[in-house]
Interface confidence: medium
């Protein structure tokens, strides 16, 4: 077990803070909830603290919760590939470019680390080149979320990882909006981290609303499990 992994044996409180600017529309979001890495489970609620969110909530899911991939459940035989927990408590910087097909792009930078016993994800997001009447600024996405695989590989030069995946957002007219994600994570501290073999995270997310909440908000339940690396040969012969 890595030193960082020991911090995730129980339920951990999570705080998310985002400042965003998309085509000049500035906004802020606060999120709170908890994560349980034993089950790969995240429960979070987000509110837009500046009024109405200028972009659809589903376009921010990867920035919020795929941002705290330290809560992914890594099976016993894959624990030596869990970069995310090994970087804790000092944490990691997570940078992404998200290209929305035939539309604009988000660039995000986040610092994910422990502050006290709370896991904090502080994010800056800049979005440019979006069409005012497109699927994103035109709010044409359905309020739901598909399952995805998130592919992880080591980046030995930067003592971190590179991550690629493609999100499929459902559009109200029945079509799909693709969002290509290019991600890199580098540790904040200078302690040892685990550099993984290639593998993937399998994610399932459910979006809902709080019937008592008047502010613009999103409630998120997510399960994430690491996969893609088989047991070693010695396991097969047990």
């Amino acid at each position: 077990m890595s030193k960082g992994e020991e911090l995730f044996t129980g339920v951990v409180p999570i705080l998310v803070e985002l400042d965003g600017d998309v085509n000049g529309h500035k906004f802020s979001v606060s999120g709170e909830g908890e994560g349980d890495a034993t089950y790969g489970k995240l429960t979070l609620k987000f509110i837009c603290t500046t009024g109405k969110l200028p972009v659809p909530w589903p376009t921010l899911v990867t920035t919020f919760s795929y941002g705290v991939q330290c809560f992914s459940r890594y099976p016993d035989h894959m624990k030596q590939h869990d970069f995310f927990k090994s970087a804790m408590p000092e944490g990691y910087v997570q940078e992404r470019t998200i290209f929305f097909k035939d539309d604009g792009n988000y660039k995000t930078r986040a610092e994910v680390k422990f502050e006290g016993d709370t896991l904090v994800n502080r994010i800056e997001l800049k979005g440019i080149d979006f069409k005012e009447d497109g699927n994103i600024l035109g709010h044409k996405l359905e309020y739901n979320y598909n399952s995805h695989n998130v592919y992880i590989m080591a980046d030995k030069q930067k003592n971190g990882i590179k991550v690629n995946f493609k999100i499929r957002h459902n559009i109200e007219d029945g079509s799909v909006q693709l969002a290509d994600h290019y991600q890199q994570n580098t540790p904040i501290g200078d302690g040892p981290v685990l550099l993984p073999d290639n593998h993937y995270l399998s994610t399932q997310s459910a979006l809902s609303k709080d019937p008592n909440e008047k502010r613009d908000h999103m409630v998120l339940l997510e399960f994430v499990t690491a996969a893609g690396i088989t047991h070693g040969m010695d396991e097969l012969y047990k």
Partner: nanobody, 128 residues
């Protein structure tokens, strides 16, 4: 927290409004859970409203639900209680409370939670 300081109390007529503020000093990192309590003479202290550290979760006592609004500004380390259309039964000394601990039962019942830090209180008097 070095100090919690309430302000904004006063004497008003029924139907008028007040906004209470509670400023915290002496902390820089994670913001605390916070709550407003009140105590009228000869009565027990009761919870009024509570708010989570990021302002995402809010809780209200049944007696003020739909009337009062709790908010916070984490840049200013300040919590607010907006109290429009006050009633004589809202008369009491209002206290703010704060707690930095995590992973407890705060969200189960924030009014029965054992808060670490308390202010000195501000008096609200509503006459008919």
């Amino acid at each position: 927290v070095d100090q919690l300081q309430e302000s904004g109390g006063g004497s008003v007529q029924a139907g008028e409004a007040l906004r209470l503020s509670c400023v915290g000093s002496g902390y820089t990192s994670i913001n605390p859970y916070m709550a407003w309590f009140r105590q009228a003479p000869g009565k027990e202290r009761e919870g009024v409203a509570a708010i989570s550290s990021g302002g995402v979760y809010t809780y209200y006592a049944d007696s003020v639900k739909g009337r009062f609004t709790i908010t916070r500004d984490n840049v200013k380390n300040t919590m607010y209680l907006q109290m429009p259309s006050l009633k004589p039964e809202d008369s009491a000394k209002y206290y703010c409370a704060a707690d930095f601990r995590r992973g407890g039962n705060w969200n189960v019942d924030p009014f029965r939670y054992d808060y670490q830090h308390w202010g000195q209180g501000t008096q609200v008097t509503v006459s008919s």
